[in-house]
């Protein structure tokens, strides 16, 4: 499970109005860090192990996911045709 945590604003810069956000995720046994719906998530470790990236549903609703030919990551294709590529280090 993941929750989005809003960090305190930088008090040394009063004009700064945007707080930083980060995810805190507590994964269950058999899960490790991944991406679901373009956000940090805990996913089945076997998905990562086998590089079946699209099985963790990394793209936003309505986008099409495809694993890169060399299994190094995935692409998310928006309905308008714009493609976002993510590679896993």
């Amino acid at each position: 499970t993941c929750e989005i945590v809003t960090l305190d604003r930088d008090s040394s810069q009063p004009r700064r109005t945007i707080a930083r956000q980060t995810a805190r995720c507590a994964c269950r046994k058999g899960q490790i860090a991944g991406t679901t719906r373009a956000r940090p998530a805990c996913v089945d470790a076997r998905i990562i192990k086998t590089k079946q990236w699209c099985d963790m549903l990394p793209c936003l609703e309505g986008e099409e996911c495809k694993t890169l030919p060399d299994n190094s990551g995935w692409t998310c294709t928006q309905p308008g045709g714009r493609i976002k590529t993510t590679t896993v280090s």
Epitope: A26, R28, K29
Partner: antibody, heavy 129, light 104 residues
Framework: AVTLDESGGGLQTPGGALSLVCKAS????????MFWVRQTPGKGLEYVAE????????NYGSAVKGRATISRDNGQSTVRLQLNNLRAEDTGTYFC??????????????????????WGHGTEVIVSS | ALTQPSSVSANPGETVKITCSGG???YGWFQQKSPGSALVTVI????ERPSDIPSRFSGALSGSTNTLTITGVQADDEAVYFC???????????FGAGTTLTVL
């Protein structure tokens, strides 16, 4: 190089308590789940306890549940096992082990016994009166 | 409990296969030359091999059974091999009873 160095073993009395410490080096300690595994005479390997990378989760084997406490200090790169109400069957060699998966920042991750990639040399515990 | 054979034997240069079944998540294989002595991981996460382990050691997962293969076994490989994984409910670690490899 990854090194795990256990200490705290030795002769213990039945009903007493022991505290084992594992000092880690050579890797980002706070990113890895850690285990204690023991080998008792005439038996194979036995899962004793484990702790998540950030210390928020702990789990224990049935033989020590209710008597054991695992904890970690990520600042000192140590993991500790406290075992109370010692019994003769607790006699054996206790190993500290690391789970290979490097948990990224913001995540709390369990280790996996099948992902143990490094072991300490072990510390021998003898429970006898 | 995990199921693995209690013993296997082979001549130098032969291929040895040791199976382990009955667990969940991933499997590892741990070598021990004598009881109470140091444990060495030869395979972790089903098929990953530590950099200092010879390439003759390999692991493969099929369903819920993992197989450790030693291709071209050597006298130095004589040891007890324990498999390890999570129990079927995924709530705790579990180890096999160990397989004694004898090189004839």
């Amino acid at each position: 190089a990854v090194t795990l160095d256990e200490s705290g073993g030795g002769l213990q009395t039945p009903g007493g308590a022991l505290s084992l410490v594992c000092k880690a080096s050579g890797f980002t300690f706070s990113s890895h789940g850690m285990f204690w595994v023991r080998q008792t005479p005439g038996k194979g390997l036995e899962y004793v306890a484990e702790i998540t990378n950030d210390g928020s989760g702990t789990n224990y084997g049935s033989a020590v549940k209710g008597r054991a406490t695992i904890s970690r200090d990520n600042g000192q790169s140590t993991v500790r096992l406290q075992l109370n109400n010692l019994r003769a069957e607790d006699t054996g060699t206790y190993f500290c082990a690391r789970s290979t998966y490097e948990c990224p920042g913001g995540f709390s991750c369990w280790g996996d016994t099948g992902q143990i990639d490094a072991w300490g040399h072990g510390t021998e515990v003898i429970v006898s009166s | 409990a995990l199921t693995q054979p209690s013993s296997v034997s082979a001549n130098p240069g032969e291929t040895v296969k040791i199976t382990c079944s009955g667990g969940s998540y991933s499997y590892g294989w741990f070598q021990q030359k004598s009881p109470g002595s140091a444990l060495v991981t030869v395979i972790y996460w089903d098929d990953e091999r530590p950099s200092d382990i010879p390439s003759r050691f390999s692991g493969a997962l099929s369903g819920s059974t993992n197989t450790l293969t030693i291709t071209g076994v050597q006298a130095d490989d004589e040891a007890v091999y324990f498999c390890g994984t999570e129990d079927i409910s995924g709530t705790a670690g579990v180890f096999g009873a160990g397989t004694t490899l004898t090189v004839l």
